[in-house]
């Protein structure tokens, strides 16, 4: 006989509530003469043998109740035209039972931890009952073709709920599962599978970038937030309030909104769905300066790319702290943003940044009732050499035959550093030029004692890694000064 | 590199005068400032210049009788320190960084330092 659950030519296990006996076979190779089947009790009536006639081209057979007892042993086995068709099996009608599909109920728990997890309660199947079923569970995303399944299997005398994790929002599922005796044999068939769809998520975290505190008219922000799963097309729905007023933008992309003016808060949700978390409302209110951060410094830290930050608190506690930089010239969307609590007075940015590039860093106080932000700082990772020396231009004469001229500043990115100092430079025709340097604070010069002739006038700035080229020249023409400038 | 050197210190009757040089070589630095330790406390930050820009800030407690200065002829910052009181005892140090903002005498910005010199002053 054949070791009881491995699978062979002939098996037969125990179906439904009913708990008749379906025994199968791989197709015969002479199909016009039907098989007969034998089954005999071992456990009961070891002396009485069944028949059961199979129709004529079925490779299957139902064993009726009446012909066995419920918890008994069977030998079975089959002839065909008298010849026996296959080695006896034997079959345990306790442990050979197909069990019913578990019933999957359709309230499913979706929790968002470390990762989107769905939570699953279901029932055993009715049939058989009173025994300890063990039951296996699978889910895939609705659309693919191939499931997964959950590990580890669940048994029915304690009915864990199904757990999975690693889900994708705005994703629909479906879950389905089968179950089979302990130690016994064969699976049940799969479920009808039970269908869900995840949430979007909310935004992580939720900013303004730009000048939501400018009082000087040139107010320019932008709401921005950070995509919970980049991978995930989403768009969203963005609400901004003030006393009665209350706008909505719809269908936005990420992850980015213009702020309108006057607005005190904003709100950020997936566009098409009810999330499970209340959206983070995030006050846009300028609170009063001596609430900012102060002493705010910024340096290059010693052995890492980064860039360290510190300050120092205003005249309360805020409930967190943010500290944002932007690259010089980037646009309002390109900022990058970190959140510290209450008791952090310092951080080091992450990320690379490069050398002789500034960075306007801000430290904002956030408080339920709004923000406060200290003045920006610019800061650089490493100054470098600048790329460009100032334009030079003449004002009228002070006192009259006496030149003024001026110079502006480099642009920022071309500075590439703080200006230490200027350097202005003259050069009359056929003799050497004569270089002065002045205060970075200075922009103008006064040019005394000049003697008649023509001359070429430019300016240089510097930073801590050195002197820059000289910026556009200037030609003076002067008929009149006798005194030669030195 | 920046390297740093300190000079200058001593001991000194309450209400004289010294002064402190400290020489600077090597570049990308913007700031230097004159930090002090006494034995038994933190270290604090007393005087700091902005180099180029000339900018200056001093400790409350010892605004109007130190003043810190930079000499480019030289490549020193110089700390020029009146009405010396005992409570002035420690080791000053200068340190030097590349500085924005007005974290003018946080310590921690300041990723360069000299071996210090001692300062007593007696009542």
């Known amino acids: 006989t054949r070791p009881h659950g491995s699978p062979g030519p002939l098996q037969c296990y125990s179906v439904g509530p009913l708990g008749i006996l379906n025994c199968s076979w791989e197709p015969l190779g002479d199909l016009e003469t039907p098989p007969v089947l034998y089954h005999q009790s071992q456990k009961y009536h070891p002396n009485r043998v069944w028949e059961v006639k199979v129709p004529s081209k079925q490779s299957w057979v139902t064993i009726p109740r009446e012909q066995f007892t419920m918890a008994d042993k069977l030998l079975i086995w089959g002839t065909q035209k008298g010849r026996p068709l296959w080695s006896s099996v034997s079959v345990n009608l306790e442990t050979q039972m197909k069990p019913d599909t578990p019933q999957i109920f359709s309230q499913v728990d979706i929790s968002e931890e470390a990762t989107l997890e769905a939570t699953v309660q279901w029932a055993p199947p009715v049939w058989p009952p009173q025994k300890v079923l063990i039951c296996q569970f699978r889910y895939k995303e609705c659309q693919a073709e191939t499931w997964t399944r959950l590990e580890p299997q669940l048994k029915t005398d304690g009915l864990t709920p199904v757990e999975m994790q690693n889900l994708e929002p705005g994703t629909c599922y479906q879950v389905s599962g089968r179950c089979q005796v302990e130690n016994g044999y064969p699976w049940g068939e799969w479920s009808s599978p039970l269908s869900f769809q995840t949430p979007f998520l909310d935004p992580e975290d939720v900013w303004v970038s730009g000048t939501v505190c400018e009082t000087s008219g040139k107010r320019a922000a932008l709401l921005v937030w950070k995509d919970p799963r980049p991978c995930v097309q989403v768009t969203y729905t963005v609400w901004f309030g003030a006393g009665d007023i209350t706008t909505t933008q719809e269908e936005v992309p990420c992850c980015k909104s213009p702020v309108p003016a006057w607005m005190e808060w904003a709100v950020v949700s997936p566009g098409n769905s009810t999330s499970w978390v209340p959206p983070t409302n995030l006050s846009l209110v300028c609170l009063a300066p001596e609430s900012a951060p102060c002493d705010v410094g910024v340096s290059s830290a010693d052995g890492s790319p980064g860039i360290k930050v510190t300050w120092k608190q205003g005249t309360r506690k805020p409930l967190e702290y943010v500290v944002d930089w932007a690259q010089d010239g980037d646009s309002l969307d390109k900022l990058n943003w970190t959140r510290l609590p209450p008791g952090n007075l310092s951080t080091l940015l992450p990320g690379e940044f490069k050398g002789g590039v500034p960075y306007r860093i801000t430290v904002t106080a956030v408080y339920s009732g709004g923000l406060a932000a200290a003045p920006s700082v610019w800061g650089f990772r490493e100054e470098l050499v600048p790329l460009a020396g100032p334009a030079v231009w003449r004002l009228p004469d002070d006192p009259p035959g006496t030149p003024v001229v001026a110079w502006g500043e480099v642009p920022r990115h071309q500075l590439r550093g703080q200006a230490t100092h200027y350097t202005f430079c003259i050069q009359s025709r056929g003799l050497s030029t004569v270089c002065r340097n002045v205060s970075s604070q200075t922009q103008t010069a006064t040019l005394p004692n000049l003697h008649l002739g023509s001359f070429k006038l430019w300016v240089t700035v510097s930073t801590v890694a050195g002197q820059g080229p000289p910026g556009p020249n200037l030609s003076l023409h002067l008929p009149d000064n006798r005194i030669r400038w030195k | 590199q920046v390297q740093l050197q300190e000079s200058g210190g001593g001991s000194v009757q309450a209400g004289g005068s010294l002064r402190l040089s400290c020489a600077a070589s090597?570049?990308?630095?913007?700031?230097m400032g004159w930090f002090r330790q006494a034995p038994g406390k933190e270290r604090e930050g007393v005087a700091a210049?902005?180099?180029?820009?000339?900018?200056?800030y001093y400790a409350d407690s010892v605004k109007g009788r130190f003043t810190i200065s930079q000499d480019n002829a030289k490549n020193t910052v110089d700390l020029q320190m009146n009405s010396l009181k005992p409570e002035d005892t420690a080791m000053y140090y200068c340190a030097a960084g590349l500085v924005y903002g007005e974290a003018w005498l946080d310590s921690r910005h300041y990723n360069k330092w000299g071996q210090g010199t001692q300062v007593t002053v007696s009542s």
């Open positions: 090597g570049y990308s630095i913007n700031r």
């Open positions: 210049i902005s180099i180029g820009g000339g900018r200056t």
